[in-house]
């Protein structure tokens, strides 16, 4: 039993930490997703392949300053943040400078993150509280999956139904024999 | 899945020493901050220390300063709790737990089910 | 060390009231955890940072407060609710956890 996932500020979702090889998509609008058009199927594209390998997706970094109550991390931390649409390997890198955007094959693809990595954390305080030391999981990487139907109804169901579901808890380190902590964790910057 | 198992209950004699393990599958121990709760007969939760297994570190409340020594073996993904000079006081369930944050919150998602140490002559 | 009072120790209720505990901080804290707990198992976390409803959890619970003052609520009690709830704090270090209280039914 766990806490489940839940949507931050940066509006990226995480879900329950290390609970999913796999961590459900994003949520976002995205207008593909219950596409109707060509009777409900992808439109046809000549690039189009069968091979999730062969799909790629931008990763677009993020950097943000972390907290627990009125405690911040000393250095902001930067993350992955897995882009909405997916399209082949060979059309991302320079597609859309040139106007040659992939359109997406309706919700067949999804962006993802792939892997998690920990980073530790130094927490600084106010009114002369110790700092605190913390381990963040932030996406590491991104990945295309192929979403079937069920998919693309059920994506929902991992996330909080209850009505209003932020973040999840937290707490500060105890102080003592910290100080080699303290000093590690000054230097956590990537 | 992620799961913490405890190690089997204990019995052992006042003064002797005990230690007590955690064992995490679907999660690398070196990820998170593994703490542990004590728990007496009828009683409420207590607030042992943490530790992180990456570097040997570990925090301890005051009252448990001299009583617990926390240490983790990475290769293994098992977090250990040994707990000396054992007094009819100390007979309790041991709980390790797994220390999440998600860059605003700490919170504790998963608990073991808890090891059960009985000190009697 | 930040004390955290749990009141009542035992709440006795019937299936369908609603009813209401609290906890008490000694001092003011960020937010607030309570985690259930029945006999034989381990905690489990229920409600984290003051409001929000841990996985599983049924939408009677809530939980709200701040400063030193943090409820949960039940707006309509089941028998499968009868358990001890303990509210837990790390706003301060060491962490501390209430003394809980009981939820019997009638």
């Known amino acids: 039993q766990g806490w489940q996932a839940f949507k931050n500020d940066a509006t990226e979702i995480i879900p329950e930490l290390g609970e999913y090889p796999e961590p459900p998509p994003e949520l976002e609008n995205n207008k593909t997703m219950n596409r109707a058009e060509n009777g409900g199927r992808p439109p046809h594209h000549p690039f189009e392949t069968k091979d999730v390998s062969e799909y790629s997706c931008r990763e677009l970094h993020f950097t943000r300053y972390v907290t627990d109550g009125p405690c911040r991390s000393a250095k902001p931390v930067t993350e992955l943040v897995c882009s909405g649409q997916c399209g082949p390997a060979r059309l991302l890198p320079n597609a859309i400078g040139r106007g040659k955007w992939w359109r997406p094959s309706g919700p067949d693809f999804r962006c993802i993150p792939d892997r998690y990595r920990a980073q530790r954390v130094q927490l600084l305080c106010p009114g002369g509280e110790a700092p605190r030391a913390r381990k963040v999981r932030l996406v590491a990487s991104c990945k295309c999956k192929r979403l079937t139907r069920f998919h693309n109804q059920s994506e929902l169901k991992d996330f909080g139904t209850e009505a209003a579901r932020p973040q999840k808890g937290r707490k500060p380190r105890p102080r003592a024999r910290s100080a080699k902590a303290n000093q590690a964790e000054l230097e956590n910057a990537y | 899945e992620v799961q913490v198992q405890q190690s089997g209950p204990e019995l052992v004699k006042p003064g002797a020493s005990v230690k007590l393990s955690c064992t995490a599958s679907g999660f690398n121990i070196k990820d998170y901050f593994i703490h542990w709760v004590k728990q007496r007969p009828e009683q409420g939760l207590e607030w042992i220390g943490r530790l992180d297994p990456e570097d040997g570190e570990s925090d301890y409340a005051p009252k448990f300063q001299d009583k617990a020594i926390m240490t983790a073996d990475t290769s293994s993904n098992t977090a250990y709790l040994q707990l000396r000079s054992l007094t009819s006081e100390d007979t309790a369930i041991y709980y390790c737990?797994?220390?999440?944050?998600?860059?605003?919150?700490?919170?504790?998602?998963?608990w073991g089910q808890g090891t059960l140490v009985t000190v009697s002559a | 060390q930040i004390v955290l009072s749990q009141s009542p120790a035992i709440l006795s209720t019937s299936p369908g009231e609603k009813v209401t505990m609290t906890c008490r901080a000694s001092s003011s804290v960020y937010y607030m955890h309570w985690y259930q707990q029945k006999p034989g198992s381990s905690p489990k976390p229920w409600i984290y940072?003051?409001?929000n409803l841990a996985s599983g959890v049924p939408v009677r619970f809530s939980g709200s407060g701040s400063g030193t003052s943090y409820s949960l609520t039940i707006t309509r009690v089941e028998a499968e609710d009868a358990a001890t709830y303990y509210c837990q704090q790390w706003s301060s270090d060491p962490l501390t956890f209430g003394a809980g209280t009981k939820l019997e039914l009638k």
């Open positions: 737990e797994r220390e999440d944050y998600d860059g605003t919150y700490t919170f504790f998602p998963y």
């Open positions: 940072a003051t409001s």
